[in-house]
C-alpha cells in the first residue's frame, strides 16, 4: 500500500507568542511529507501546509479567528511524491496534537518601553502596545485590545547608581512614578496575566532603558488614555 513506509509524526508541540502560533513536530522527513489539519472541538477539520517537507506549520491564521476557542491539530504522514489523486483509500498514519487554547496559552512576548518623560519629580513611562494578528472588523488588534484588563504590566526601576529595585504595576500601558530630582533611573517592564496559574503567566523582561539616553528625550507618544 502507499503508506507502508511512512512513520507517524510525534512530539507535536505548540509554539505561540502574542498569538503567532506554529505547530512543530518530529521526525525530520525521510521519503515522506506531511499535511496538517486543525479544528475546534465542535468544528470541521481544515487542512494546512499540504504535503510539506517541513516539520512545522504556521496555524496563526486559523487560531486568530477565535482566540478563546480550544483547538486540536493532527499531522498526517504521506510517502514522498504522494499526490491526492493516487486513489489510495488507506488512511495515512497521523498523530494528534495536545489541545491548545490561544487566549490561555500563548506566551507573552518581550515588551518594549516606548518612551519615558520626566516632569519634575515624576516620570511617565509608556509601554509599547504590541500588535497581534488577531482581527476584529478587518482591524488588527493590539495585545491590550485582546487581553483587556487580564493583562497588567510590572515596572522595575532603580537609580543608575544603585541596585535596589522598586516596582509599580498598572492595568494600562502607562506608569507615573516618583523619582528623586537629579538622579538618573533605569527601567524594565514585564507583561503579566495574573489570572494564569501556569509558567506562561509572565513575559521575559523588556530591554533596560535608562534616563539620559535618547529614548527618554524623544517624547514619543503612545496609546494615551484619559486619566483621572
Amino acid at each position: 500500500s502507499g503508506t507502508t513506509n511512512t512513520v507517524a509524526a510525534y512530539n507535536l508541540t505548540w509554539k505561540s507568542t502574542n498569538f503567532k502560533t506554529i505547530l512543530e513536530w518530529e521526525p525530520k522527513p525521510i521519503n515522506q511529507v506531511y499535511t496538517v489539519q486543525i479544528s475546534t472541538k465542535s468544528g470541521d477539520w481544515k487542512s494546512k501546509c499540504f504535503y510539506t517537507a517541513d516539520t512545522e506549520c504556521d496555524l496563526t491564521d486559523e487560531i486568530v479567528k477565535d482566540v478563546k476557542q480550544t483547538y486540536l491539530a493532527r499531522v498526517f504522514s504521506y510517502p514522498a511524491g504522494h499526490v491526492e489523486s493516487t486513489g489510495s483509500t488507506e488512511e495515512p498514519p497521523y498523530e494528534n496534537s495536545p489541545e491548545f487554547t490561544p487566549y490561555l496559552e500563548t506566551n507573552l512576548g518581550q515588551p518594549t518601553i516606548q518612551s519615558f518623560e520626566q516632569v519634575g519629580t515624576k516620570v511617565n513611562v509608556t509601554v509599547q502596545d504590541e500588535w497581534t494578528l488577531v482581527r476584529r472588523n478587518d482591524t488588527f488588534l493590539s495585545l491590550r485590545d485582546v487581553f483587556g484588563k487580564d493583562l497588567i504590566y510590572t515596572l522595575y526601576y532603580w537609580k543608575s547608581s544603585s541596585s535596589g529595585k522598586k516596582t509599580a504595576k498598572t492595568n494600562t500601558n502607562e506608569f507615573l512614578i516618583d523619582v528623586d530630582k537629579g538622579e538618573n533611573y533605569c527601567f524594565s517592564v514585564q507583561a503579566v496575566i495574573p489570572s494564569r496559574r501556569t509558567a506562561n503567566r509572565k513575559s521575559t523582561d523588556s530591554p533596560v532603558e535608562c534616563m539620559g539616553h535618547e529614548k527618554g528625550e524623544s517624547r514619543e507618544t503612545g496609546h494615551h488614555h484619559h486619566h483621572h
Epitope: 488588534l141 485590545d145 484588563k149 498598572t170 489570572s195 484619559h226
Partner: antibody
Framework: QVQLQESGPGLVKPSQTLSLTCTVS?????????WSWIRQHPGKGLEWIGE???????RYNPSLKSRVTISVDTSKNQFSLKLSSVTAADTAVYYC??????????????????WGKGTTVTVSS | EIVLTQSPGTLSLSPGERATLSCRAS???????LAWYQQKPGQAPRLLIY???SRATGIPDRFSGSGSGTDFTLTISRLEPEDFAVYYC?????????FGGGTKVEIK
C-alpha cells in the same frame, strides 16, 4: 461630561432573552475605557455582570457566563447586554457604567466612575 | 470568588457624628483594587473612594478610606444630612468583581 443611558423592555417573559442597550454620550466609547453592566435585585446589593472594551474583549461573572453576551457597537457609541433563559430571579434594576483609569501607587487602575440611572426589568409571564 | 463582608449592616447616627464602616475580604485584596460607593434611594451608586484611600473627583474631604489586605475602612468624619445612604465596598482585582452587602447609615 460623559453620560450613560440604559434602554430596553421593562418586562420580559420567563425563558426569553433580556436585551438592554447603553448609549454613551459626551465621549467616545473607544477612548480607552471599559464598559460594565451591573444589576441590583429589589432591596438587595449590587452584582457585577460583566464588562467590555471597545475592541470587543470581554470579562463575565462566571455565575452568569453561560447566559450572558455583552457586545459593543463603536459606530453607534453603544454597548449592549443580552441575558438568555431568564427567570424571576433576573428581576432587577440594571445599570451600565464606565470603567475609567485612575492613578494609584505608580500605575493606573479602573473604577466604575460614571453610571447610568438604571432601568428596571421585571421577568414575569 | 472574593466575598466582601460589610459591618455593621445598619449604623444609626446623628448629623455631626463620626461614621466608621468596615469591609472585610475573604482573601487578600490589593489596595489598588478596592473602592467605596455611596447609593441613595432611587439613584445609581456614586464612586467615593478608589485605591482604598484616594477620593474620587468632587468627593468632600470628610470621606476617607484606609486599610490593606483583608480589612478596609471608610470613615465619614462629620456626618452631613446628605451622607445618610447605603455604602458599598467593591473589589475589582479578581473576576468576578464583587461588592459587599452594604452598610446603611441612617439618621438616629
Amino acid at each position: 461630561q460623559v453620560q450613560l443611558q440604559e434602554s430596553g423592555p421593562g418586562l420580559v417573559k420567563p425563558s426569553q432573552t433580556l436585551s438592554l442597550t447603553c448609549t454613551v454620550s459626551g465621549g467616545s466609547i473607544s477612548s480607552g475605557q471599559y464598559w460594565s453592566w451591573i444589576r441590583q435585585h429589589p432591596g438587595k446589593g449590587l452584582e457585577w455582570i460583566g464588562e467590555i472594551y471597545y475592541s470587543g474583549s470581554t470579562r463575565y461573572n462566571p455565575s452568569l457566563k453561560s447566559r450572558v453576551t455583552i457586545s459593543v457597537d463603536t459606530s453607534k457609541n453603544q454597548f449592549s447586554l443580552k441575558l438568555s433563559s431568564v427567570t424571576a430571579a433576573d428581576t432587577a434594576v440594571y445599570y451600565c457604567a464606565r470603567d475609567a483609569p485612575y492613578y494609584y501607587g505608580g500605575g493606573y487602575y479602573y473604577y466604575m466612575d460614571v453610571w447610568g440611572k438604571g432601568t428596571t426589568v421585571t421577568v414575569s409571564s | 470568588e472574593i466575598v466582601l463582608t460589610q459591618s455593621p449592616g445598619t449604623l444609626s447616627l446623628s448629623p455631626g457624628e463620626r461614621a466608621t464602616l468596615s469591609c472585610r475580604a475573604s482573601q487578600s485584596v490589593s489596595s489598588s483594587y478596592l473602592a467605596w460607593y455611596q447609593q441613595k434611594p432611587g439613584q445609581a451608586p456614586r464612586l467615593l473612594i478608589y485605591g482604598a484611600s484616594s477620593r474620587a473627583t468632587g468627593i468632600p474631604d470628610r470621606f476617607s478610606g484606609s486599610g490593606s489586605g483583608t480589612d478596609f475602612t471608610l470613615t465619614i468624619s462629620r456626618l452631613e444630612p446628605e451622607d445618610f445612604a447605603v455604602y458599598y465596598c467593591q473589589q475589582v482585582g479578581v473576576v468576578p468583581y464583587t461588592f459587599g452587602g452594604g452598610t446603611k447609615v441612617e439618621i438616629k
